[in-house]
């Protein structure tokens, strides 16, 4: 503690100001990160502040502009991609968002050798996805749900697929449910390491029921948006994987990769594809009942001109206590022998750890162990494996980067980041150059984010890439709330929480409490990251205490906590929020007559159920875009955690866990229900059904819809939303405007 003369203290106090809602809505205190666009072991590209595309060579220290902002501006480019042979750049413009990851765009190819755009055989528009081959300058792209190949940018295209049809057959791009719930990408095609083969998925949505909603626009009649969207228990997309030889694409055409027999015997999903070599590929499949996953390694048979997936190269991953994997089934990282691999899955104690698989999963060698979890394998080189975990000091909401030396025996482990900037940085990710010659560390907090460049052999810091100096200066006169991350031990369950406290917090006073909840399976809200957001403002200016609690069903603390919610969503997540609130009241500084809860999406579901729990703890609450019944949500997500809504499976809990079933219990709380009418993800139907149930029960509530807005409620809707929610909470807590 530093004691200052009161005069100085007071004058400093006077210059300090609280956060305003305007600060938040304007993004005044947003931070920057720096992820190098690696193009070799020691070179990366970066878009400068003035929009030049600059190539940096770490070893020579030189940099030069490969593409000027003038060229970018000539086609209004918002993105770019350099071909691996460095002869061409694609420029992306006319970005038009579709779903979470997908968008269409117009693409122009710029020839760096002559400084001109490629004329002749120009690309059609709009394109759904485009990418260079990993070597040379072949192009693969998806247009109108079909895949095309160009050997060179100026060549005529070779059409690979012909059956693509809007909302029916998707080639090389996922349909809605695969994009959102399985692949988490806008693409479904994968080049082999040297560009010899191109693998792609075909999704057949012909038999999937369609969700239809109105898009009001400006016309006399609204448009109807139709999306093939399988809800829980509905017919799912049929997926097939094909691989085509891009050197001789017309010779045998696309060859289908066989599905393992044990998977093909009932409904299934394709979950990911990993190329091992140009002639070896690894596919992961998942039964519709998502507790069995099969990893299948397939080899190209030149004599067959197709792919052989022997049973001896099938590896089964099964969960007996929950679903397979965490949020997704983890993907393998292959070692240099091109057959053995490293993979994260649960160990015998129920913690997710790195295992080395050489022949069978049963004989896997465990690489990491402990009552913590390995989270991501970044890179495997000849002698090192880089991964992230939350091991350090036993804080599950931290992420540090570790290196295990796999070249020596026994392997030694080193934490690369633990002591770099210990107070400022406890939550890292990393980005590696080829062969891990260099890497960038991106620290997200809890202090102001910073991105640094490091030597891949010595781990020495080479330079700071971005340290957010402007942000640091801007925050100097801001009274930021205090944050603490602690845990509660309740009935053998550890509940980690983050508490955001007003700047002049005094334990002897009473404060209104707002619980912010997400709580979805395999999520984590209590993280050691920096943020200046709406809840920061509520603490700083409005004097609220905000708490985030990770209860049962959340991630990175072992399977016992994670799989506790299996087949019974909406029970323990809510119980644990309530338990935490009771513990917070016991701490003595919470005004128990002024407690609110709010959440978005899954958090809207949990906040609604908490408000309707009948505990009398909550005065008011907000649900933004909530799920209201699991029968309304996507099959892939819902069934992973809930099984099927059939009599012989889990229909009873599907029915018991709806918000509508608890309509009567909203009578004694103030409820604000908010939803976008064009929500492709959690359909407006969910809130419509809540509203109907509340009306039928003659329960008063408040509601706000956002016309033509999706699940993100972006743009001007964001400002309106947070202003509206602020008024609601201030009214609930009797805070003056």
């Amino acid at each position: 503690i530093v004691l200052r003369p009161s005069r100085v203290h007071n004058s400093e106090e006077n210059t300090m100001r609280a956060l305003t809602l305007k600060d938040i809505l304007n993004g005044t205190f947003s931070y920057k990160t720096f992820f190098p666009n690696w193009i070799s072991g020691q070179e990366y590209l970066h878009q400068s502040a003035d929009n030049n595309i600059v190539l940096y060579n770490i070893e020579t220290g030189q940099s030069y502009t490969i593409l000027s902002n003038r060229t970018m501006k000539s086609v209004n480019a918002s993105n770019y991609g350099l071909s691996p042979d460095r002869q061409f750049v694609y420029l992306e413009s006319d970005y038009s968002k579709l779903w979470r990851y997908s968008y269409t765009a117009t693409y122009y190819i710029y020839d760096l050798s002559n400084g001109e755009f490629v004329r002749g055989n120009e690309l059609p528009r709009p394109i759904q996805y485009l990418c260079w081959s990993p070597v040379g300058s072949k192009l693969a792209y998806v247009y109108q749900n079909n895949i095309y190949l160009k050997q060179r940018p100026g060549d005529p295209p070779f059409q690979i697929t012909f059956n693509g049809r809007e909302n029916k057959i998707f080639n090389g791009i996922p349909d809605w449910v695969y994009e959102e719930e399985m692949l988490a990408t806008k693409y479904a095609l994968w080049w082999s390491p040297n560009g010899k083969f191109l693998a792609y998925a075909e999704f057949n949505d012909t038999d999937i029921p369609v969700i239809a909603y109105s898009y009001y626009g400006d016309e006399q009649y609204p448009r109807t948006i139709n999306i093939p969207y399988p809800k829980a228990g509905a017919k799912n997309p049929v997926v097939r994987i094909f691989i085509i030889d891009t050197t001789y694409p017309a010779y045998v055409g696309p060859q289908e990769v066989p599905v393992p027999a044990m998977i093909a015997s009932s409904d299934y999903y394709f979950s990911w594809l990993t190329w091992v070599t140009d002639e070896r590929v690894c596919l992961q499949w998942l039964k519709r009942v998502q507790n069995v996953s099969v990893l299948s390694i397939c080899d190209f048979r030149e004599d067959w001109q197709t792919w052989d997936c022997p049973k001896t190269q099938e590896h089964i991953e099964e969960s007996r206590t929950g679903w397979a994997g965490g949020f997704f089934v983890s993907t393998p990282v292959f070692s240099y022998d091109a057959i053995s691999y490293y993979k994260i899955f649960s160990d015998k104690d129920g913690y997710k750890h790195i295992h080395y698989i050489k022949d069978t999963v049963e004989n896997a060698i465990q690489i990491t162990s402990g009552k913590w979890e390995a989270i991501n394998i970044f890179r495997v080189t000849q002698d090192s494996l880089f991964y992230s975990s939350n091991e350090f000091e036993e804080y599950p909401g931290r992420r540090n980067i570790y290196r295990i030396s796999i070249g020596s025996y026994p392997p030694s482990k080193k934490c690369v980041t633990c002591h770099l900037r210990k107070e400022r940085c406890q939550y890292y990710t990393a980005s590696f150059s080829d062969y891990a010659k260099y890497y960038a560390l991106v620290c997200y907090g809890p202090g102001i984010p910073i991105s640094t460049l490091h030597d891949g052999r010595t781990d020495q810091e080479i330079k700071i890439l971005e340290e957010n100096k402007e942000l640091e200066n801007a925050l100097k006169n801001i009274q930021l709330p205090k944050e603490e991350i602690k845990k509660l031990e309740v009935d053998e369950i550890t509940l980690w929480y983050k508490m955001i406290l007003p700047p002049q917090f005094d334990r002897s006073k009473k404060y209104p409490l707002l619980i912010q909840v997400y709580g979805g399976p395999c999520s984590q809200s209590v993280r050691s990251v920096f943020a200046v957001n709406w809840i920061s403002y509520l603490a700083s200016k409005e004097g609220m205490v905000i708490a985030l609690v990770d209860g049962r069903g959340t991630a990175f603390q072992g399977d016992k906590l994670l799989y506790a919610v299996y087949r019974k969503l909406g029970v323990y997540e809510v119980e644990d929020q309530i338990t935490a609130v009771r513990k917070f009241i016991e701490m003595g500084f919470i005004d128990e007559k002024r407690i609110a809860i709010w959440g978005w999406s899954y958090g809207g579901y949990v906040s609604s159920l908490a408000l309707a729990s009948g505990t009398g703890l909550f005065k008011c609450g907000i649900a933004v875009a909530p799920v209201s019944s699991w029968e309304y949500y996507a099959s892939v997500y819902t069934e992973r955690f809930m099984g099927l809504p059939t009599k012989d499976d889990n229909l009873e809990h599907y029915k018991n866990s709806t918000v509508m079933a608890r309509a009567e219990y909203f009578r004694n709380v103030d409820y604000l229900l908010i939803h976008g009418t064009a929500d492709d993800n959690v359909h407006f139907q969910n809130s419509a059904q809540i509203a109907k149930a509340l009306v039928n029960a003659q329960v008063d509530f408040q509601a706000m819809w956002y016309s033509d807005q999706n699940h993100g409620l972006s743009g001007l809707s964001t400002n309106h939303l947070y202003t509206h929610m602020t008024h609601f909470l201030k009214q609930c807590f009797s805070l003056s405007d």
Epitope: Y248, A264, E302, D303, D308
Partner: antibody
């Protein structure tokens, strides 16, 4: 149309070498595998190996490993099979055959055959 | 290596009759997608001619009286109505594993 034309009959002494050629036409030579199959008088067919002119990939039957060499000349669309250290039991008709693209290992076009006689 | 055994060694039939030729593999030559078994016809002094590929697919230009069936280890070539030009030696061949192997042949002769 697809044609595979082989070189003429050869008579060789034991211990010598023979090189049989197979000229392809009517398709893109670099796209398809060329197999070599032999048939001793009055006997069945024996697979010797294959070569992919496009990738240069080669597979030999184990029993001939070290004695056989398969090569191609893409400029003339010709495949060659050389067999060294000839023995009397190498006397056979030697066929080249094209690998059918979607045939999964079936041989859809065959050369007319080259009779190689090994005799002292 | 995979050994293919053809039966019978010789089959004596008359034109117009149905011929059934069998080929048994020492281990499965099928995957979930395909059966890697093919059938050839060879006449004296000629090169073999492909009839059926991947167990049941008729090669173009081959009359449809020829058909193939089977999977795993047991395969059959059927000629529904024998024509005079069908009398020859028939070989099965597997391409499931290297080395490729042929059966010893079935001689189809006129009764």
């Amino acid at each position: 149309q697809v044609q595979l034309v082989q070189s003429g009959a050869e008579v060789k002494k034991p211990g010598a070498s023979v090189k049989v050629s197979c000229k392809a036409s009517g398709y893109t030579f670099t796209e398809a595998i060329i197999h070599w199959v032999r048939q001793a008088p009055g006997q069945g067919l024996e697979w010797m190996g294959w070569i992919h002119p496009g990738s240069g990939s080669i597979k030999y039957a184990q029993k001939l490993q070290g004695r056989v060499t398969m090569t191609t000349d893409t400029s003339t669309s010709t495949a060659y099979m050389e067999l060294r250290s000839l023995r009397s039991d190498d006397t056979a008709v030697y066929y080249c055959a094209r690998h059918g693209g979607t045939g999964r290992g079936a041989m859809d076009y065959w050369g007319q055959g080259t009779l190689v006689t090994v005799s002292s | 290596e995979i050994v293919l055994t053809q039966s019978p060694g010789t089959l004596s039939l008359s034109p117009g009759e149905r011929a059934t030729l069998s080929c048994r593999a020492s281990q499965s030559v099928s995957t979930s997608a395909y059966s890697y078994m093919h059938w050839y016809q060879q006449k004296p002094g000629q090169a073999p001619r492909l009839l059926i590929y991947a167990a049941s697919n008729l090669e173009s230009g081959i009359p449809d009286r020829f058909s193939g069936s089977g999977s795993g280890t047991d395969f059959t070539l059927t000629i529904s109505r024998l024509e005079p030009e069908d009398f020859a030696v028939y070989y099965c061949q597997q391409s499931r594993e290297l080395p490729y192997t042929f059966g010893q042949g079935t001689k189809l002769e006129i009764k």
